[in-house]
């Protein structure tokens, strides 16, 4: 059904990562545009991307007016210069994606490690707190601003001489942990949100090393 | 708990109007597009209205659009439809119900009757 | 319109049987379906939405498949309180229901 020659989107997909959102779909347009709608479960219906040959529409706008709403996206599908042209139904032809919630669903980030400072046998291990995309009071929040104690970070780390590796974890960005005199550590971090059933962990952060550039050492 | 309450019905003449309320409780009613659906006498369901949570969209059955009106009062937690010219084939149970996107029903009131009779 | 039709529109069965309800859309609706059971003089109550995913709160023994233009609704052990009136709805394009089902004892 619908306009003739048009065909529907399909494989509608949600790719987030830290908030950044974008829906992608297929297939790639022959002599057809699409338009992108977006909503929470109001049913206020907001377009976006207009008539585009893409097939793809970036909606981190709309998603982070509230990361805890639930959205739904709805693809139409119009004939190349005859974007008034309607379906069978009496409107043109679309399909929904699934549904998306980005506070429980957003991938997290791979996370960095700031730096990482020892002061005796003690090292303090400080993760960068990334900024997102989500807005309150015209300021940008970082991932701990919105996941608040949702997220923990896991740090690994390890004897450069050794394959054994131990493992910390924190509900802020700081790690403090004992290692051995004179020897050096590699380090390596990945954020967690254990209350999630889906995408609870990040990808780990690049591993860093005492003796390169990040780390300070004081006795 | 998730209620709605519709209240307004009665017996109307035909060419008569009348104005049905739901009012709900246990959820943010601004959050949910809400909808009317009705069923008459020994017959199946019948969409009748739907509304967007702001209540900028508003959509209508063909068998009721320019005759019956959609409208809510977020501040008051309260769906409306305001039934003008009514005829005998829309006596029914009238049921207002919350409608995730506008799209689905997953809440439902225990519904109020419109006869419509001379 | 898309037109929704259900079959069979009676159904006597024994509790204990498994019931299949099938509903076929004019044009294809995808997976937007939903399946709702209604008792006498009471109000609908959602089953099923998105063809197959279980409301919460509703038993198990209710599932929902389908894709495209035909749908049904399983009933795996059918239970006294499973006693009523089933309709499907699509809302692919406005929305539209049924005919409905009603399932009687046997």
């Known amino acids: 059904s619908g306009t003739t020659n048009t065909v529907a989107a399909y494989n509608l997909t949600w790719k987030s990562t830290n908030f950044k959102t974008i829906l992608e779909w297929e297939p790639k347009p022959v002599n057809q545009v699409y338009t992108v709608q977006i909503s929470t479960k109001s049913g206020d219906w907001k377009s976006k991307c207009f008539y585009t040959t893409d097939t793809e529409c970036d909606l981190t706008d709309e998603i982070v007016k509230d990361v805890k709403q639930t959205y739904l996206a709805r693809v139409f599908s119009y004939p190349a210069g005859n974007v008034e042209s309607t379906g069978s139904a009496g409107e043109p032809l679309y399909e929904n994606s699934p549904e998306f919630t980005p506070y429980l669903e957003t991938n997290l980030g791979q996370p960095t490690i700031q730096s990482f400072e020892q002061v005796g046998t003690k090292v303090n291990v400080t993760v960068e707190d990334e900024r997102t995309l989500v807005r309150r009071n015209n300021t940008f929040l970082s991932l701990r601003d919105v996941f608040g104690k949702d997220l923990i970070y896991t740090l690994y780390y390890w004897k450069d001489s050794s394959t054994g590796r131990k493992t910390n974890t924190t509900h802020t960005n700081e790690f403090l942990i004992d290692v051995d005199k004179g020897e050096n550590y590699c380090f390596s971090v990945q954020a967690v949100i254990p209350s999630r059933t889906v995408n609870r962990k990040s990808t780990d952060s690049p591993v860093e090393c005492m003796g390169q550039e990040k780390g300070e050492f004081r006795e | 708990e998730v209620q709605l309450l519709e209240s307004g019905g009665g017996l109307v003449q035909p060419g008569g109007s009348l104005r049905l309320s739901c009012a709900a409780s246990?959820?943010?009613?601004?959050?949910?597009?809400m909808g009317w659906v009705r069923q008459a006498p020994g017959k199946g369901l019948e969409w009748v209205s739907t509304i967007s949570g702001s209540g900028g969209l508003t959509y209508y059955a063909d068998s009721v659009k320019g005759r019956f009106t959609i409208s809510r009062d977020n501040s008051k937690n309260t769906l409306y439809l305001q039934m003008n010219s009514l005829r005998a084939e829309d006596t029914a149970v009238y049921y207002c119900a919350k409608a995730p996107y506008g799209y689905y029903m997953d809440v439902w009131g225990k519904g109020t009757t419109v006869t419509v009779s001379s | 319109d898309i037109q929704m039709t259900q079959s069979p529109s009676t159904l006597s069965a024994s509790v204990g049987d498994r019931v299949t309800i099938t509903c076929r859309a004019s044009?294809?609706?995808?997976?937007?379906l939903a399946w709702y059971q209604q008792k006498p003089g009471k109000a609908p109550k959602l089953l099923i939405y998105k063809a197959s995913s279980l409301e919460s709160g509703v038993p198990s023994r209710f599932s929902g498949s389908g894709s495209g233009t035909e749908f049904t609704l399983t009933i795996s052990s059918l239970q006294p309180d499973d006693f009523a009136t089933y309709y499907c709805q699509q809302y692919k394009s406005y929305i539209t229901f049924g005919g409905g089902t009603k399932v009687e004892i046997k």
């Open positions: 246990g959820f943010t009613f601004s959050d949910y597009a």
């Open positions: 044009q294809s609706i995808s997976s937007w």
